[in-house]
């Protein structure tokens, strides 16, 4: 199967939304878990994630061509704690497959601002304040 | 058509290495992970450990000190190693596709 | 490690009867569990996952349930095929664990 991970984020208003998409073939779906994690390097699993995500199969979706999911993680406020290196990761031990996101960072700046760095995939960003940057 | 065929010695001596090979067909190993499993005769079924799709490996922390699982992905190839056999390591040992599609099993027998 | 206990370890059922069986695990897994069925001679064959997921092509007289630490399956209708040692598997922590068994016999 041809499945992979991506990460985006997206600002609305003070809100940051951390995105998890896991591009996959429909009957691929069951037994996918997607989680988030934040500084673990080696064992992101989603007994230490933030949020995670268990797919299902949609019958409402017909054929065979590539689909996606989507796990978000909401902050509503960006603070010092949120400071950190995050990983999207999905998993299925059903059929042995496991799927590590690229690290990306927030970095919460002593101006108050945050920057959002490491996320080489496509974004939809909508931008409401200018107190936080996405690079 | 998704099929896992075990092979390797029939017999082993005690306190030699097993090697095992599971040749896959109808999957690609960088796509789906393979796992290893074995059951003694007339007993219940162990998991022994995992060797994911992009190569990564899990073990059974019984096993872990003498067990080590590889692969070849170019010849669809997934290649299980233990050493120092004791009798009790007698069983059909299986490989899977994740845990949904098993070989058969090949029986390993530990005896001088 | 996870203990998978699982009762009873042998039933005497009759074709077309509803049989129960129960997979207690030690520690909350959560739904990560697999049904197993094995014929003598043959590999083990997926019937359940995620606790009550029917695997492709099982018999739908085949239903898992259950979260946690205690899981069931059920077959309604048990026919003569049915006949064999059913496992659970626990896949939450490493290592995956099995239960010891559920062997099924004609009274």
């Known amino acids: 199967g041809c499945i992979n991970i991506t990460s985006s984020a997206s600002q609305e208003g003070t809100r940051l939304n951390l995105i998890c998409t896991v591009w996959h073939k429909k009957e691929e779906a069951e037994g996918f878990v997607v989680f988030l994690c934040k500084d673990r390097s080696g064992d992101c699993s989603p007994e230490t994630s933030l949020k995670q995500l268990r797919l299902k199969r949609d019958p409402g979706i017909d054929g065979v061509g590539e689909i996606s999911s989507q796990l978000m993680f909401t902050i509503s406020q960006v603070t010092p704690l949120h400071s950190g290196t995050y990983q999207c990761c999905a998993r299925s031990q059903k059929s042995g497959i496991r799927l590590q996101g690229h690290f990306f960072s927030i970095l919460f700046t002593e101006t108050g601002n945050y920057t959002v760095t490491g996320l080489k995939q496509r974004q939809h960003l909508e931008f409401s304040h200018n107190e936080g940057t996405l690079s | 058509e998704v099929q896992l065929v075990e092979s390797g010695p029939g017999l082993v001596q005690p306190s030699e290495t097993l090697s095992l090979t599971c040749t896959v067909s109808?999957?690609?190993?960088?796509?789906?992970?393979v796992n290893w499993f074995r059951q003694p005769p007339g007993k219940g079924l162990e998991w022994m450990g995992t060797i994911w799709n992009d190569g990564g490996t899990d073990y059974n922390s019984a096993l872990k000190s003498r067990l080590s699982i590889s692969r070849d992905t170019s010849k669809s190839q997934v290649f299980l190693k233990m050493n120092s056999l004791q009798t009790e390591d007698t069983a059909i040992y299986f490989c899977?596709?994740?845990?949904?599609?098993w070989g058969q099993g090949t029986l390993v027998t530990v005896s001088s | 490690d996870i203990v998978m206990t699982q009762s009873p370890k042998s039933m005497s059922i009759s074709v077309g009867d509803r049989v129960t069986m129960n997979c207690k695990a030690s520690?909350?897994?959560?739904?990560?569990i697999a049904w197993y069925q094995q014929k003598p001679g043959q590999s083990p064959k997926l019937l359940i996952y995620?606790?009550?997921n029917r695997y492709t092509g099982v018999p739908d007289r085949f239903t898992g349930s259950g979260s946690g630490t205690d899981f069931t399956l059920t077959i309604t209708n048990m026919q003569t095929e049915d006949l064999a040692v059913y496992y659970c598997l626990q896949y939450n922590y490493n290592p995956w664990t099995f239960g010891g068994g559920t062997k099924l016999e004609l009274k």
């Open positions: 109808g999957f690609s190993l960088t796509s789906y992970g």
């Open positions: 995620y606790a009550s």
């Open positions: 520690q909350n897994v959560g739904k990560n």
């Open positions: 899977a596709r994740g845990f949904e599609y």
